[in-house]
């Protein structure tokens, strides 16, 4: 008899007819940029400070009647879904909201920078706990408004924004498209995506992770004890704003990069139907649906991983695309993805003191992504080693020749237009599994990490016959950091990790015919840190 | 409404006296840039937020946003300082015509200049 | 069905604390659906929230008794209790203890107040 | 707080006639007013809720009205059973009761 988004982000070991997690959030402080809120309605009475902070634009409309319990519908009923003593997420977590959205729920670009600004300044005056920002709120793409989130996050603030309730992709909005934002998609209780009306949540790969989102149980500004049930992507960022004020009251030390990547690895995993996705979009956007931890502690063992996928190329003949991992992430390994098959592969490269993975556009290709695994891997130093062309029939090869160092993936970029029409490498030896192998004509890249206790091992799966995706997956305990494909021949479209599983993708298998170059390996470097393991049993 | 334009003439007449004294060459480098929202009903022109490069501090963010203002006066244009910026992003939010775009896109210390657009609730 | 019953002393000293307890029967109090309420009525009076708890322990209290009032809820025994301290002549009263739909499990209904107990007259007296 | 006055203190009618009671709030309530039937030595019994919504169990004959600040009891018949006090309660704002109206046979 529990409302179903509480269930659903219940891990089993919790559920009962009451949801009662340990910890509910109470070291954290949870900021609220929205609407004006009903603060003495009885699910926050008492846990919700509402700042002296308003910025809002007026009302559009000469007839417009401000009519309270309106006003304060949209704030009030997030702050119910965050903290709401028996409908809220982290039911000890305390707020305080910032009113940025008028009684239509409108704002400005500028008034929510200010209301960061205030936050800041906050923080500052008076530092206290882990601080959530929750913006419910979406606009155009904004470099400003992207910009503030950023500083405020590297001021190590965690910001917590909605999709956008558009049905498009997430990249055209901000805060959604800000990368050190955790921005959310709508589920529903069928974990499928949320159609709000002709629309629905935003998609795409500048959404971190969905969380229940439509007809969600909360506090109703229309009294003082009533309960509406809303919908929209300002619902899915309530519990994960909630999540993350449980995760940060039982570990105040996380940092955001730690933070989303235990929320991504909690994540229940590819239980939303990809179908409601345009095409394009199905491979860019997360299959996750946010939940709680099981455990509050021992996470801390694992190596966690993510996916990052870059922005499109676009179609010229020499674009790139370039994805990044966040400052406390490593890049572990790199890939590329082209629906044509036209690239020209990828490489690791250092840009500002830090690694990115870059992906090359073939000419008459229509584009590129590049697709970064960016892990947590504390005391790591990672570098690249190159081979260039070999131009032997065996193919290139490099390998990880420093002491201590263990490939953690493999990378090849090529200059030459068609890889297809030349003669596919050999396999590579066994027994050799500090060593990417490539095609003759291709520089490879490895990535070659020195962390304590990081031990890697090479998982490949290979098909003779023609197929238009194999996969590879790292087993229990162990981490997916590389993906990549054998042999790198043209009708690859390209490799890139979902999950801990490595996925090759191949054209359209019609096209192909089933010649020795249909055979496709998926090669896994999988990854385990025993040093993490050790430090988590210490703390136990 | 009358009383905002009001204190905005008296502020600008203010200003004038000090516009003698202030050059107006841009900063050697990299041109500032103008950005605004792709989706055009959420626009809101006239209002800017004006950002300048990292490093800038609040006295040289109320310098740049003073000289502004007097460069704008001497075109015949009123402007209003709405806020500076300063804690997280180097800056000023102001109202202005369009029309002074360029002029402040040469300002010194400028990195970019974005109108400002609606933001609504999801 | 759902039945209500207090108990407790009929009569409190001035100054001293009431204490009642409210036994369900026929129905789970460690449910979603509903908050359990207290209310009180004067001789020949009209009724007086005084306030609710859920299962979960979040309490809710008339702003005017705020400072008096303590609820409690034993799930295990599908209890609450009723504790009002620094009584006087002023708190002799039937006290009920009635369910209230929360609101939070929408098929509950709104949150009216029914079935009640049949309630308990408590006098404050030396 | 939110003050609900209850008129007429008393209302003298005979069983078979048109019963009429009013509910005054100190302030909007919206629809979230509810009205209680309580006769002597037995608790409340809930009757109307969210201002014209019979509860379950309740015979036709008794039917709520209004909005705002103005509410209304309507007992279109009276029966024998009928004759007792009746309170309104709001939860607009936490939970408040009227002072009641006690309906006697005249």
């Known amino acids: 008899s529990i409302p179903w988004n509480l269930e659903r982000i219940t891990p089993p070991r919790y559920r009962a007819d009451e949801y009662q997690p340990p910890d509910g959030g109470s070291l954290v402080e949870v900021y609220l940029l929205d609407t004006s809120i009903q603060s003495d309605h009885r699910e926050i009475e008492g846990r919700v400070m509402v700042t002296d902070f308003e910025n809002v634009p007026e009302e559009d409309g000469t007839r417009f009647h401000r009519q309270a319990s309106k006003c304060d519908s949209h704030g009030t009923h997030l702050a119910g879904v965050v903290s709401g003593r028996d409908a809220g997420v982290a039911k000890g977590a305390s707020m305080r909201s910032l009113r940025v959205l008028n009684c239509q729920g409108k704002g400005t670009v500028s008034g929510t920078l200010i209301g960061l600004e205030f936050i800041r300044k906050s923080q500052l005056v008076q530092p206290v706990g882990p601080l959530v920002v929750l913006l419910p709120l979406a606009g155009g793409y904004s470099r400003v408004l992207n910009a503030a989130c950023q500083r405020l996050a590297r001021a190590g603030v965690v910001l917590v924004t909605a999709a956008g309730n558009f049905r498009d992709d997430a990249c055209l909005y901000s805060p959604a498209s800000a990368p050190e934002v955790i921005t959310v998609g709508a589920t529903n209780a069928q974990d499928q995506p949320v159609t709000l009306g002709t629309l629905g949540t935003n998609f795409g790969r500048c959404v971190d992770l969905f969380a229940p989102g439509e007809d969600i149980i909360g506090a109703s500004s229309d009294c003082s004890t009533c309960f509406v049930s809303q919908s929209g992507t300002s619902q899915a960022a309530a519990h994960v704003a909630g999540i993350a004020a449980m995760m940060l009251s039982a570990e105040p030390e996380l940092t955001l990069a730690e933070l989303r990547q235990r929320l991504i690895h909690f994540s229940a995993k590819d239980v939303i139907n990809e179908a409601w996705f345009p095409e394009d979009q199905r491979v860019l956007t997360p299959n996750l649906v946010a939940a709680l931890p099981p455990s509050t502690h021992g996470a801390g063992w694992q190596l966690f991983c993510r996916t990052v996928w870059s922005a499109h190329s676009g179609p010229t003949r020499m674009a790139t695309a370039v994805a990044r991992c966040a400052p406390d992430e490593e890049l572990l390994s790199c890939s590329s993805f082209s629906r044509s098959g036209k690239r020209r592969g990828e490489r690791m490269e250092a840009q500002g003191g830090k690694l990115v993975c870059r992906a090359h556009n073939a000419f008459g290709g229509e584009g590129v992504y590049a697709i970064a695994r960016c892990c947590l891997l504390p005391q790591a130093n990672c570098s690249v080693h190159t081979a260039p062309p070999a131009e032997a029939s065996m193919g290139t090869r490099v390998h990880c020749h420093q002491q201590g160092h263990v490939l953690t993936g493999c990378s090849s970029h090529w200059e030459v237009e068609d890889l297809g029409t030349h003669k596919p490498p050999v396999l590579r030896p066994r027994g050799q599994p500090n060593q990417c192998v490539g095609h003759r004509e291709a520089s490879i890249h490895a990535s070659c990490c020195h962390a304590p206790g990081l031990e890697c091992k090479v998982k490949e799966h290979g098909i003779p016959a023609p197929q238009e995706q194999v996969t590879v997956a790292c087993e229990e305990g162990w981490t997916l950091t590389g993906c990549s494909a054998l042999p790198g021949t043209s009708h690859v479209l390209g490799a890139y990790a979902v999950d801990n599983t490595c996925v090759v993708r191949s054209r359209d298998v019609s096209t192909t015919g089933s010649t020795s170059e249909g055979a496709v390996t998926a090669v896994a470097i999988c990854c385990r840190s025993r040093h993490l393991a050790q430090a988590s049993q210490e703390l136990q | 409404q009358e009383d905002e334009d009001g204190d905005y003439e008296e502020l600008v007449l203010a200003l004038r006296s000090e516009e003698d004294g202030l050059a107006e060459a841009p900063e050697h480098g990299t041109t500032a840039t103008f950005h605004r929202c792709a989706k055009d009903p959420w626009r809101l022109p006239g209002t800017y937020v004006v950002v300048l490069k990292e490093e800038t501090h609040l006295s040289q963010s109320e310098r740049t946003a003073r000289r502004l203002q007097a460069q704008a006066a001497r075109r015949g244009y009123l402007t209003k300082i709405l806020h500076v910026f300063h804690g997280l992003l180097p800056g000023f939010l102001v109202k202005m015509s369009g029309d002074l775009l360029e002029l402040a896109l040469k300002l010194p210390h400028v990195d970019y200049i974005e109108e400002d657009s609606s933001v609504f609730a999801q | 069905q759902l039945q209500l019953q207090e108990s407790g002393p009929g009569l409190v000293k001035p100054s001293e604390t009431l204490s009642l307890t409210c036994t369900v029967s026929?129905?789970?109090?460690?449910?979603?659906?509903?908050?359990w309420g207290w209310i009180r009525q004067p001789p020949g009076k009209g009724l007086e929230w005084i306030g609710s708890?859920?299962?979960?322990?979040?309490?809710y209290y008339n702003p005017f008794l705020k400072s008096r009032v303590t609820i409690s809820v034993d799930t295990s025994k599908n209890q609450f209790s009723l504790k009002l301290s620094s009584v006087t002549a002023a708190d002799t009263a039937v006290y009920y203890c009635a369910r209230e739909n929360s609101g939070v499990v929408p098929a509950a209904g709104p949150n009216w107040f029914g079935p009640w107990g049949q309630g308990t007259l408590v006098t404050v007296s030396s | 707080e939110i003050v609900l006055t209850q008129s007429p203190a008393t209302l003298s009618l005979s069983p078979g006639e048109r019963a009429t009671l009013s509910c005054r709030a100190s302030?909007?309530?919206?629809?979230?007013l509810a009205w209680y039937q309580q006769k002597p030595g037995q608790a409340p019994r809930l009757l109307i809720y969210?201002?014209?919504n019979r509860a379950t169990g309740i015979p036709a004959r008794f039917s709520g009205s209004g909005s705002g600040t103005d509410f209304t009891l309507t007992i279109s018949s009276l029966e024998p059973e009928d004759f007792a006090v009746y309170y309104c309660q709001q939860r607009r704002n936490w939970f408040t009761f009227g002072g009641g109206t006690k309906v006697e046979i005249k």
């Open positions: 302030q909007s309530v919206s629809s979230y």
């Open positions: 969210d201002a014209s």
């Open positions: 026929g129905g789970s109090i460690s449910s979603s659906s509903y908050y």
């Open positions: 708890i859920y299962y979960s322990g979040s309490t």
